[in-house]
């Protein structure tokens, strides 16, 4: 219907228009994680606040057990920021002495799980080497892009090291999606 | 009206559909900041270009006095990038000698002000420790997410150190919002 | 038609509403780059996957020869992430000795080309000094914002050093746009 006025009423076939306010949307915010059992060789998934403060889910977009459930097929914009913070000594010393007391990298992955498909699909990855000179370091990784999703798909955010996630403030670490 | 064709004309009740081109939208770009009085314990707010070059406001989204004014309630995608740049010597030397010639961190906050609410709400924060080895450093912080806003809400971008903001190019530092 | 019910059928003037699923959209993913001739003083453009894996173009948004072609005028959200990775020795040594074996910075630019306009327009730039202490480094630069584009405009992603782009995974380096 690009640029075209609606036809008069005797024409009964219409495109499936819908109110924007009716579209599935969610913005989830960080909460303190509880230590859990991780699957081998898989980054742990974060769990989220879905109704308090800035967080919400609406129009059949539901959050359950670390997953956002996609209620209808379509193109979604998906985004997340994870702020990491850690402690470290001089990086080159760590490398030289082979002391492994800090991660070489921090990574965020937004993952899609489709029940009919055996393997999860990595939609977005932000990965950064961490080699900070100072004793305290902190930094965010932001991701966002558009994907075609199917009804029943599930989205989660995985991180390389859950113990480095800054869970103190809802504006620092978050996860969202909305139907375009 | 999800996935449903419009009913024939004798049915007079319709969802509040609206033309997408009619939605409030703004993309603001950086300008050189003028020194101002900052409130104690509050990061200073940036002011912006709203009509020249790539910048625009449309459909009743107005910019005034460092604020974007939200003209209608709904879910908005809000984003900003601030590019910081500075000069520093070896970070660990600064720490040891306690020399304050560089920030320990750079921070961007997108803040919502609601007149009926006494405290501003921090919607998004990007914060990063800065401990650069080289003498010149520069880096962006990007933020973006969806929030439910009310008519009359005001949005601003605050930064930890206004003197480190790169105001030289409109594509490096910017702020925008649009109704979904 | 903001907030207004549709008028009964005898009123023949309508706003140009359109189905959301009909809007031009693209998400492109990284592929291994082939060495090409670069224009002097211009960052090289990346080329992209447009139909395999997570990549797609739809509703007349076409990809050709490193460019996304804008098929209709309107406001678009445009985004890209480029993950860079490199090898380096101690940064201060490089500076002191003036050895050029690593970039001083990594930069991503999303550029608009309009045939009727002689110069490309830089819409978005993410630029970061790179002065890593460790021997291996990697990091993403993410960009995203809204722009008013005209039918026939072309979009591309330019980078400061094509040899440092991580082309190994489609979730690490990508480029997309969608009509709002």
């Amino acid at each position: 219907l690009k640029g075209q006025e609606f036809a008069p009423s005797h024409q009964q076939v219409y495109a499936p228009l819908r109110a924007d306010g009716d579209k599935p949307r969610a913005h989830l915010t960080v909460v303190r994680q509880t230590p859990t059992q991780h699957f081998k060789n898989q980054f742990p998934a974060l769990h989220w606040e879905h109704e308090l403060g800035l967080a919400f889910t609406k129009n059949r977009m539901n959050y359950t057990n670390k997953f956002l459930l996609i209620p209808e097929s379509g193109d979604y914009f998906i985004y997340s920021q994870v702020t990491f913070r850690g402690m470290t000594s001089e990086c080159s010393e760590i490398r030289q002495a082979g002391r492994p007391n800090k991660p070489d990298s921090i990574t965020v992955v937004i993952t899609k799980v489709t029940d009919s498909y055996p393997e999860p699909t990595q939609l977005l990855m932000g990965t950064k080497s961490v080699c900070e000179v100072g004793s305290n370091w902190f930094q965010p990784i932001y991701l966002g892009a558009m994907f075609s999703l199917q009804e029943g798909d599930k989205l989660m955010v995985n991180v390389s090291d859950i113990s480095l996630v800054d869970y103190t403030k809802e504006d620092k670490t978050f996860f969202g999606a909305f139907l375009l | 009206l999800k996935g449903q064709e419009f009913a024939p004309s004798h049915q007079q009740v319709y969802a509040p559909l609206r033309a997408d081109g009619d939605k409030p939208r703004a993309h603001l770009t950086v300008v050189r900041q003028t020194p101002t009085q900052h409130f104690k314990n509050q990061f200073p707010a940036l002011h912006w270009e709203h009509e020249l070059g790539l910048a625009f406001t449309k459909n009743r989204m107005n910019y005034t006095n460092k604020f974007l004014l939200i003209p209608e309630s709904g879910d908005y995608f809000i984003y900003s990038q601030v590019t910081f740049r500075g000069m520093t010597s070896e970070c660990s030397e600064i720490r040891q000698a306690g020399r304050p010639n560089k920030p320990d961190s750079i921070t961007v906050v997108i803040t919502k002000v609601t007149d009926s609410y006494p405290e501003p709400t921090q919607l998004l924060m990007g914060t990063k420790s800065v401990c650069e080895v080289g003498s010149n450093w520069f880096q962006p912080i990007y933020l973006g997410a969806m929030f439910s806003l009310q008519e009359g809400d005001k949005l601003m971008v605050n930064v930890s150190d206004i003197s480190l903001v790169d105001y030289t190019k409109e594509d490096k530092t910017f702020f925008g919002a649009f109704l979904l | 038609l903001k907030g207004q019910e549709f008028a009964p059928s005898h009123q023949q003037v309508y706003a140009p509403l359109r189905a959301d699923g009909d809007k031009p959209r693209a998400h492109l993913t990284v592929v291994r780059q082939t060495p090409t001739q670069h224009f002097k003083n211009q960052f090289p453009a990346l080329h992209w996957e447009h139909e395999l894996g997570l990549a797609f173009t739809k509703n007349r948004m076409n990809y050709t020869n490193k460019f996304l072609l804008i098929p209709e005028s309107g406001d678009y959200f445009i985004y890209s992430q480029v993950t860079f990775r490199g090898m380096t020795s101690e940064c201060s040594e490089i500076r002191q000795a003036g050895r050029p074996n690593k970039p001083d910075s990594i930069t991503v630019v999303i550029t608009k080309v309009t045939d009727s306009y002689p110069e490309p327009t830089q819409l978005l730039m993410g630029t970061k000094s790179v002065c890593e202490v460790g021997s291996n480094w990697f990091q993403p630069i993410y960009l995203g914002a809204m722009f008013s584009l005209q039918e026939g405009d072309k979009l591309m992603v330019n980078v400061s050093d094509i040899s440092l782009v991580d082309y190994t995974k489609e979730d690490k380096t990508f480029f997309g746009a969608f009509l709002l």
Partner: antibody
């Protein structure tokens, strides 16, 4: 659910060493930092340091540097804290604790009383 | 090291009272402050993180506020089970440090 079970009480002479163990269950042991904290009788809490079970990396409070050693055995999900050259003011309840971040203590062991007396 | 100073060291209150405990850091710790409750003969219990965020399962009568150097723990209406010792802990940097504790006893 998460559980941390510590070894039993110890009585040691000044100058000796003590090793306290902490067996973890109910979560991925290698995924979270393990801390050691002590509390002298009638006193407050004092942090000794941490171990990252995945890598064995440690971070000790300066006060205990050179006297404390933290180790782990990932095959049995157990962390160990050894304190050497004991003095009478090392008499305390020693706790292991873990949490979802490197700096918070969501879960605590039951505590191990170490008494240093000649 | 960052010093944490709590006040008061002890206080007496009655069931139903509103009680406030303060904690001051020797330098700014942003919002990186945790609160714990400890009863005699048991390990401490985690109450509040990030200065103001309630740990899962903690009753809503507990609240925290503050940022930078000055923080407070408030119990809006004391219950019998709340009589205990409370500790603040900075989680900004190592070494991790605790306040000396505030003993809350029945009046």
């Amino acid at each position: 659910q998460v559980q941390l079970v510590q070894s039993g009480a110890e009585v040691k002479k000044p100058g000796a060493s003590v090793q306290v163990s902490c067996k973890a269950s109910g979560y991925t042991f290698t995924g979270y930092y393990m801390h050691w904290i002590r509390q002298a009788p009638g006193q407050g809490l004092e942090w000794l340091g941490w171990i990252i079970p995945n890598s064995g990396g440690t971070n000790y409070a300066q006060k205990f540097q050179g006297r404390v050693t933290m180790t782990r055995d990932t095959s049995i999900s157990t962390a160990y804290m050894e304190l050497s050259r004991l003095r009478s003011d090392d008499t305390a309840v020693y706790y292991c604790a873990t949490g979802s971040s490197w700096e918070g203590f969501d879960y605590w062991g039951q505590g191990t009383l170490v008494t240093v007396s000649s | 090291d960052i010093q944490m100073t709590q006040s008061p060291s002890s206080l007496s209150a009655s069931v139903g009272d509103r009680v406030t405990i303060t904690c001051r850091a020797s330098q700014s710790i942003s919002s990186y402050l945790n609160w714990y409750q400890q009863k005699p003969g048991t390990a401490p219990k985690f109450l509040i993180y990030g200065a103001s965020r309630l740990q899962s399962g903690v009753p809503s009568r507990f609240s925290g506020s503050g940022s930078g150097t000055d923080f407070t723990l408030t119990i809006s209406s004391l219950q019998p089970e709340d009589f205990a010792t409370y500790y603040c802990q900075q989680s900004d940097t190592t070494p991790i440090t605790f306040g000396q504790g505030t003993r809350l006893e029945i009046k």
